[in-house]
Amino acid sequence: LRPSRVHNSEENTMRALTLKDILNGTFSYKTFFPNWISGQEYLHQSADNNIVLYNIETGQSYTILSNRTMKSVNASNYGLSPDRQFVYLESDYSKLWRYSYTATYYIYDLSNGEFVRGNELPRPIQYLCWSPVGSKLAYVYQNNIYLKQRPGDPPFQITFNGRENKIFNGIPDWVYEEEMLPTKYALWWSPNGKFLAYAEFNDKDIPVIAYSYYGDEQYPRTINIPYPKAGAKNPVVRIFIIDTTYPAYVGPQEVPVPAMIASSDYYFSWLTWVTDERVCLQWLKRVQNVSVLSICDFREDWQTWDCPKTQEHIEESRTGWAGGFFVSRPVFSYDAISYYKIFSDKDGYKHIHYIKDTVENAIQITSGKWEAINIFRVTQDSLFYSSNEFEEYPGRRNIYRISIGSYPPSKKCVTCHLRKERCQYYTASFSDYAKYYALVCYGPGIPISTLHDGRTDQEIKILEENKELENALKNIQLPKEEIKKLEVDEITLWYKMILPPQFDRSKKYPLLIQVYGGPCSQSVRSVFAVNWISYLASKEGMVIALVDGRGTAFQGDKLLYAVYRKLGVYEVEDQITAVRKFIEMGFIDEKRIAIWGWSYGGYVSSLALASGTGLFKCGIAVAPVSSWEYYASVYTERFMGLPTKDDNLEHYKNSTVMARAEYFRNVDYLLIHGTADDNVHFQNSAQIAKALVNAQVDFQAMWYSDQNHGLSGLSTNHLYTHMTHFLKQCFSLSD
């Protein structure tokens, strides 16, 4: 006989998570990323909104900009000029797409404690940045680029052809912002500010997506966005460089496109300055399996940029597309010609390579059945990178240092044993010359940010440890989490299972699959989260599982490229396979299994529900893609090729959700979409709904008026409340 646990007072004070906790963000965490301004100094916005400068070596900190000054213009962001004379203050933030926004900018002169008057900046500005040295300003206003030598000077207009929705200078159009760069800017200062490079995007021939924005007016507005869907006309890109000291002297000079790229449709993928007179551009064929890295030099005699064929490096994939989600960027070494870059090795794992003359002669720096994920910094003697090597868990991230100053290079894991239980997923932020760095640990325990010495890796101080969150969670019954793997037909399926707090293997639980599953994504990660699915496990007693199947990242090209030209097949199969394995574990109620996903996950959940397996009782698709012909060219064609007869039209047609309308008859389906989704257009759900109606299949639906792909604000609360009711009804759980 075991003693009753009723009298355990600690157990009694514990409570389950509530939906309100999640919607209120009660258990959100903080991270600390220093805004580095030198090798040993950084800026940080204090809790009371003062901008404080910290000097690590002297241990001192002081306010450089008061909250009073910030408040005087309602500033929500700031940027210090490298010469430390001025600060720009950003206010009237107005979001556009994922990264882009417009804002009003004020320049504050630190030497006299006053705002710069005269030649004020126009408003609203689309992008603004300081030069890397001094206090020159480059900004984009109404799709044109302007330059100021000093904040109080009149501006010099660099481009004149900018036009809304037609020509974009220094900022990307919709598709380059979302799928290629992916940034809000498309201009780059040279290291000492001598030159400014920028992209011009010509969208004149791109078809336009138009949708209604209802607002409060009598007549809805129409939003028009040049948006190339699969197979459509794409933006035409050109790269220019201008001398910022004498901008009117020769004006912007165009950088030539490599001949093998220019012969057909192509993309520009990134620009990296090497020195003030050497620049590296990366280009990509429209069929995205060939990428060219081109190193160009400034010719003083002609005032032009020369990109010799001998400095072109080709990266090609024979089994899939070039790169992972994006083609990786080079990190140049101090000789200003050789560089480090991540690409697939001969065994099909993404690893760091050192390229000195040709890609064929590249020296492989890392190797193994794991992947190098990001190169953070290269110094004279060290290379810092992240990988998922440690203990063979693909969903972890640790930071490593390779000593490149000695031979053979030695490797050290900086983070593997720091806080092993708490921290298995790190990123890092380095000061100039990697004198110091911050580590930000995202989990699996409560996130923590720490400051470290760049030479010894010694921890100097804790920047943020989320003490309040730790205290707040003390009386919460959090679900248990497991990360394990299934081996099925030579495929490894990693999964994360979230289990109710009082989980008992001898009982039966409803199962919810949360899926994303897009190419080069990863859902099974060792990170901390208290979110909707945590609540569903904690309070509603559900088991939730996330599975990384074929097409997902960081486990080698075999898994990643398995979905090439065949989206919507193996991702779905692998979710189904995993569910069958979960049922075999004995604690899943096979009559109560659901699946849900958002975006690509909505596509996969829809196809899984319509797979005809009878495994799923119900499911939810939020903002799903329903046909790859409706989605963006850059993303879709990377994985699917073109929707033409002589390419891959057949699979474009076979992989739609609409083609499977009949199969929804025996499941409960909830379809959700925002009407102002600029990314996955409402068209996708409209077509699913039409096909279901035409097939006389019952389903549930919810639209969110004027909401985009993120369904933010009050819509979020409504969305999760609505989905909770739907799942509880499906699983026969009392309200």
Partner: nanobody, 117 residues
Framework: QVQLQESGGGLVQAGGSLRLSCVVS????????MAWYRQALGKERVWVAG???????NYADAVKGRFTISRDNDKNTVYLQMNSLKPEDTAVYYC???????????WGQGTQVTVSS
């Protein structure tokens, strides 16, 4: 509390030279990035020259090639060597952190430099 004590100013003929010193004491350290500023009569205070903690320097266009900022960490002192002085260099010269710290008592008394023609 930070104390900033500027000295070395004076009256000098155009074309002449002066060397300003600034001793930093209190809860501050001259190894921080430091700068010289100046304020002419009836004008706003402007930045003149700066030295970042790694030793690199920067100058306002008006003084480039004539003024040199340096420091001696052991003495907690920042210097401004001013050559080829012009009448328009006449001002009260101050030193401070770069960017300047704000708040009461964060500026010293300054040192007057007068350049006669």
């Amino acid at each position: 509390q930070v104390q900033l004590q500027e000295s070395g100013g004076g009256l000098v003929q155009a074309g002449g030279s002066l060397r300003l010193s600034c001793v930093v004491s209190g809860s501050f350290d001259s190894r921080n990035a430091m700068a010289w500023y100046r304020q002419a009569l009836g004008k706003e205070r402007v930045w003149v020259a700066g030295i970042i903690s790694d030793g690199s320097t920067n100058y306002a266009d008006a003084v480039k090639g004539r003024f040199t900022i340096s420091r001696d960490n052991d003495k907690n002192t920042v210097y401004l060597q001013m050559n080829s002085l012009k009448p328009e260099d006449t001002a009260v010269y101050y030193c401070n952190a770069w960017p300047p710290r704000i708040g009461l008592g964060s500026w010293g008394q300054g040192t007057q430099v007068t350049v006669s023609s």
